[in-house]
């Protein structure tokens, strides 16, 4: 499975969307887990509602929220108030009994906000410029290329 690399700013929210075939995964709960080491187990962070028809309702564990649109085949995970310690390798999983099928591997990278490290007074923005062209203004970004991890 290819690994998707997602970047988010520290202190902000990062939204992850994992898509799957709604029919193949019919009736299955979804989970978000954190990979402990390259070959280690995947530690469950949060899973969708125990009643499958209610999977669209948000379930929270700490600063991580999960919700599943089981008809469209999209499970969405939101990592709120992103911290440096949240960086790492995660998995979206589809649960069937005691088995877990990996839907997607996600590498989360946390970017430090450059404003935190400098005096805002040192920054100068031309009056006529309403935005930084090409600057990163999204709360989260996804690299277009997919990086493969073993």
């Amino acid at each position: 499975l290819n690994t998707t690399v997602l970047q988010g700013m520290a202190g902000q929210s990062l939204r992850v969307s994992c898509t799957y075939d709604a029919l193949k995964h019919w009736g299955r709960r979804k989970a978000w887990c954190r990979q402990l080491g390259e070959e280690g187990p995947c530690q469950r962070v949060v899973s969708t509602h125990g009643v499958w028809l209610l999977a669209f309702l948000k379930k929270r564990n700490g600063s991580t929220v999960i919700a599943d649109d089981t008809l469209a085949g999209t499970v969405t995970i939101t990592l709120k108030n992103l911290q440096a310690g949240d960086a790492g390798l995660y998995q979206c999983q589809s649960l069937r009994g005691r088995e877990a099928e990996v839907l997607q591997k996600v590498l989360v990278e946390v970017l430090e906000d450059p404003l935190d490290d400098q005096d805002a007074g040192d920054l100068w923005v031309p009056e006529e410029s309403s935005s930084f062209e090409g600057a990163q203004v999204e709360h989260s970004t996804s690299r277009n290329q997919e990086t493969s991890f073993p």
Partner: antibody, heavy 119, light 107 residues
Framework: QVQLVQSGAEVKKPGASVKVSCKAS????????MSWVRQAPGQGLEWMGV????????VYAQKFQGRVTMTRDTSISTAYMELSRLRSEDTAVYYC????????????WGQGTLVTVSS | DIQMTQSPSSLSASVGDRVTITCRAS??????LAWYQQKPGKAPKLLIY???SLQSGVPSRFSGSGSGTDFTLTISSLQPEDFATYYC?????????FGQGTKVEIK
């Protein structure tokens, strides 16, 4: 026992809309997804879409996108399917069918509603 | 969309016969296949799901097998009430699709 009772036959003119109802009994309406399948005279079965009765979320077959609307009223355990801009090819028997969570197969079906589109 | 092809499209058989209907998927659907029986003027009735699981209340003379792209519905000993049209349905890839049907007639 589980029952899905559909509204009666309809005759519509091309361009009109039709709304078919499906009243569920004998089980918890919000515990199962509801789908709609149609069958033209002498033809096979064609899946139209599905609704989650709790959230109201829907997914429609591409062929019917923009023409079909599936809704529900949980207070009376009833699902609805509305098809607009009818044409003669929409003449068919329309079935509601319940989907259990253990498999995407249709375990109980309504008796069917014949919709005839004719000028 | 996945195409489901049933064969034969119709067959004639006698009471007590062993009847086999096949269904082929245009791509691998694992074991995500269901079989239905439909009698004239009636709604379809679920017989088999997940290729081989018998739906509650369905007689044990009905059985299903297969995986991947090729599937079979077998009626071990045809009964008078079994004369009907049979449909397969794949439920492994969106959207779900049906075969064109196999009509089982009295010889």
């Amino acid at each position: 026992q589980v029952q899905l009772v559909q509204s009666g036959a309809e005759v519509k003119k091309p361009g009109a809309s039709v709304k078919v109802s499906c009243k569920a009994s004998g089980y918890t309406f919000t515990g199962y997804h509801m789908s709609w399948v149609r069958q033209a005279p002498g033809q096979g079965l064609e899946w139209m879409g599905v609704i989650n009765p709790v959230s109201g979320n829907t997914v429609y077959a591409q062929k019917f996108q923009g023409r079909v609307t599936m809704t529900r009223d949980t207070s009376i355990s009833t699902a609805y399917m509305e098809l607009s801009r009818l044409r003669s090819e929409d003449t068919a028997v329309y079935y509601c069918a319940r989907i259990p969570s253990y498999t995407y197969a249709f375990d109980y079906w309504g008796q069917g509603t014949l919709v005839t589109v004719s000028s | 969309d996945i195409q489901m092809t049933q064969s034969p499209s119709s067959l004639s058989a006698s009471v007590g016969d062993r009847v086999t209907i096949t269904c082929r998927a245009s791509q691998d659907i694992s074991n995500y296949l269901a079989w239905y029986q439909q009698k004239p003027g009636k709604a379809p009735k679920l017989l088999i799901y997940r290729a081989s699981s018998l739906q509650s209340g369905v007689p044990s003379r009905f059985s299903g097998s297969g995986s991947g792209t090729d599937f079979t519905l077998t009626i071990s000993s045809l009964q008078p009430e079994d004369f009907a049209t049979y449909y397969c349905q794949q439920h492994g890839h969106s959207p779900t699709t049906f075969g064109q049907g196999t009509k089982v007639e009295i010889k």
